[in-house]
């Protein structure tokens, strides 16, 4: 099994900050920066393919061995195809050599080839041909070598170029150990650990769950502590059998037919709930019976359910240009509590019998989709119009079927809504009055009739008719209160009258306007 890797050297992670020694100085290996995936990357490169007799060395800095006995060297590099150079570059090579040297001290810039032992000749699996080079497709090779046992305090690696066109993009040195073991449904790999201090002679290692086991959501993963002696101690965290499996000794076994398990947990497999079909082995859920469904948010342990029947009873009570709709809950809830209602509206012109949607022209006391209450008021209805309202009952599984459960009610609107009246301006002898009615009703209005009289005078009143939405009442007495009412007149007769408003003329010349 893969051991935990303790990294001793990582060239790529240092982002060009490691100054390695080159020999001969100023020739051969060179630290280069390039751009890959819009990020700067660093590499040591050499490409003396036409000069012949190359012997260029690149030596790492001194690496402290720590507790490692065997080290692993991972190289990522690219090598250009010798045939991509003119005339094949006769002295060109496609390999380089990897060396190491152990020492108890850092020799600094004192470099001697004879101190180094060859590990291997490194050859690429894939060479970079001309087309890849031009297209900047870096053919990255990964090679790993193991060296050991090591006995000195530290070591150097060295790379010898003998005439290749090569770039080293990554050099990573690490070590590992501790025997593989199985604990609490987790497998722990071979690892080598270093005593962090005398007080803490343990290294923490993460385990991997056995087949069909996972780390619980939000939980702590399986951890063990590896001592310098290679012993495992103090397990932390756990693995749980994944959905469809339950724990049997140190393994996870598939649920039996008729049982299921929907999530990773310590619990055993559960029996399939009501209105489901018997499951097969290893089931993570049980399928619903025909006509029954499961909403996306329903727990798999919950019985399957179905859409509700229509609202049981529906009434529509007209109130001028408003209608109050009331209904009662469906008799069959489908086994669910999440019932909501939606109201839609259709209007029909009595003269032509033509019908159409009126969703855009009416106002609802609350949004007509997903109502939880069993009543709603609809306003801004047009006079002399027939309305049909549909109330649909839905629940969490209604979207999963094509049929709808609804009831309808019809109502005729005979009057316009009363105009909303306001005082725009006044003087000692006049009152300027304006009003409004909902836009959908305006096309029905032929004229507006303004009736006014002095407050306290029950014997006489004045009437003023107009096409517009405002009128100025002249010839009034100063400092006097007048009772004013506005009524819409339609071809079919009178609409609803406004409230009777009290407006007073100014008693003396003063401010001619009144803020309303």
């Amino acid at each position: 099994a893969q051991g935990k890797e303790v990294v001793l050297l990582d060239f790529a992670a240092m982002k060009g900050e490691l100054g390695w020694l080159t020999h001969p100085y100023g020739k051969g290996w060179d630290l280069m920066q390039n751009i890959m995936n819009d990020m700067p990357i660093y590499m040591y490169s050499v490409c003396n393919v036409v000069s012949g007799d190359q012997d260029n060395w690149l030596r790492t800095n001194w690496v402290y061995r720590e507790e490692a006995e065997r080290i692993f060297i991972e190289l990522k590099f690219t090598v250009r195809d010798c045939n991509s150079f003119p005339g094949g570059a006769s002295s060109c090579k496609e390999t380089f050599n990897l060396y190491y040297a152990e020492s108890d001290v850092d020799y600094g810039t004192n470099f001697q080839k004879r101190q180094f032992t060859k590990i291997d000749t490194i050859a690429p699996d894939e060479i970079t041909v001309s087309s890849d080079f031009e297209a900047r497709n870096v053919k990255l090779n990964v090679e790993e070598r193991m060296v050991g046992p090591l006995t000195r305090k530290g070591f150097y690696l060295a790379f010898q170029d003998i005439g290749a066109c090569v770039a080293l993009l990554s050099v990573r040195v690490y070590y590992k150990k501790c025997p593989e073991m199985l604990q609490s449904l987790a497998r722990f790999p071979e690892t080598i650990a270093v005593a962090v201090s005398d007080a803490q002679p343990l290294a923490t290692v993460a385990g991997t769950c056995v087949d069909h086991a996972v780390v619980p959501y939000g939980g702590e993963g399986p951890l063990m502590h590896c001592t310098v002696d290679g012993e495992w101690l103090v397990p932390i965290g756990q693995c749980l059998c994944q959905e469809g499996y339950e724990k049997v000794e140190d393994a996870c076994q598939a649920c039996s037919p008729g049982f299921f398990k929907s999530e990773a947990s310590e619990s055993p497999c559960l029996q399939c709930p009501e209105h489901t079909l018997p499951s097969t082995e290893g089931a993570t859920s049980c399928q619903c019976e025909e006509g029954y469904f499961r909403a996306p948010e329903d727990p798999l342990s919950m019985p399957c359910t179905r859409p509700p029947s229509a609202p049981h009873y529906l009434t529509a009570i007209g109130m001028g240009a408003k209608v109050e709709l009331r209904w009662t809950a469906p008799q069959d809830t489908g086994g669910r509590k999440d019932i909501v209602y939606s109201v839609t509206c259709e209007q029909c012109w009595p003269e032509s019998g033509e019908c159409g949607s009126c969703e855009a022209s009416v106002q609802y006391s609350e949004p007509p989709q997903a109502l939880t209450r069993t009543s709603v008021t609809v306003s801004d209805l047009e006079p002399h119009m027939n309305y049909t309202f549909t109330v649909e009952a839905r629940n969490g599984v209604s979207d999963l079927v094509n049929s709808r459960s609804f009831r309808t009610a019809s109502v005729s609107i005979n009057q316009t809504e009363p105009p909303k009246v306001r005082l725009e301006d006044r003087s000692t002898t006049s009152l300027s009055v304006a009003w409004s009615i909902p836009v959908p009703q305006q096309s029905r209005v032929w004229k507006y009739e303004v009736t006014y009289r002095k407050k306290g005078d029950a014997n006489s009143y004045n009437v003023h008719r107009t096409d517009g939405f405002s009128v100025t009442l002249d010839g009034l007495a100063p400092g006097t209160t007048y009772l004013v009412q506005v009524q819409a007149l339609t071809q079919e007769g009178q609409g609803a009258g406004s409230k009777v408003h009290e407006f007073q003329t100014l008693s003396t010349e003063g401010s001619a306007t009144m803020a309303v």
């Epitope: 751009i35 970079t128 001309s130």
Partner: antibody
Amino acid sequence: EVQLLESGGGLVQPGGSLRLSCAASGFTFSHYMMAWVRQAPGKGLEWVSRIGPSGGPTHYADSVKGRFTISRDNSKNTLYLQMNSLRAEDTAVYYCAGYDSGYDYVAVAGPAEYFQHWGQGTLVTVSS
Amino acid sequence: DIQMTQSPSSLSASVGDRVTITCRASQSISTWLAWYQQKPGKAPKLLIYKASNLHTGVPSRFSGSGSGTEFSLTISGLQPDDFATYYCQQYNSYSRTFGQGTKVEIK
């Protein structure tokens, strides 16, 4: 021997169009990245556009983007530069230049390219 | 775009002199720099690429050095054929910008 020969230059009015050609010989044209570089009278060099060995990708200097189009016909060993909406500031000698990775002795290609081979240039004058 | 600044813009020298031209980039371009020589009425010629690599057929009296933002071109023993204008060019970005040129004249 590598040879690049430009043609198609001449006098054109502002707003006009011109198509430059560059005939290549003495090398495998389809291996080369090709480019156009210009030099206004008495001034320095300015890179204009490049095209990859197989016809892509293409890049353009900001000053010509949307007006100039680089293309190549590897079967005819010819590079083209279609110049539209020409301006007085486009007046220059236009050089055709090439780059072959075989002559680039580096292990990993640079982010862009330099120019190993150049034609003798063709003069484009934009004036009314 | 990366700006390339050459200095000096011109210089006078004698045959046999050692001449150095510098080129400064407005941001780091690693070693992605080329040098060209141009004579009046002629096309430029490549001298050096990747800051220090001599192009095939270029005399060894030409050498280049530098990395990051500071670069130089040195002619170790000026020859009569070397009197020309020299340009640096970065190819660290797709804009591939040139320096404004340095004219080397006979003293």
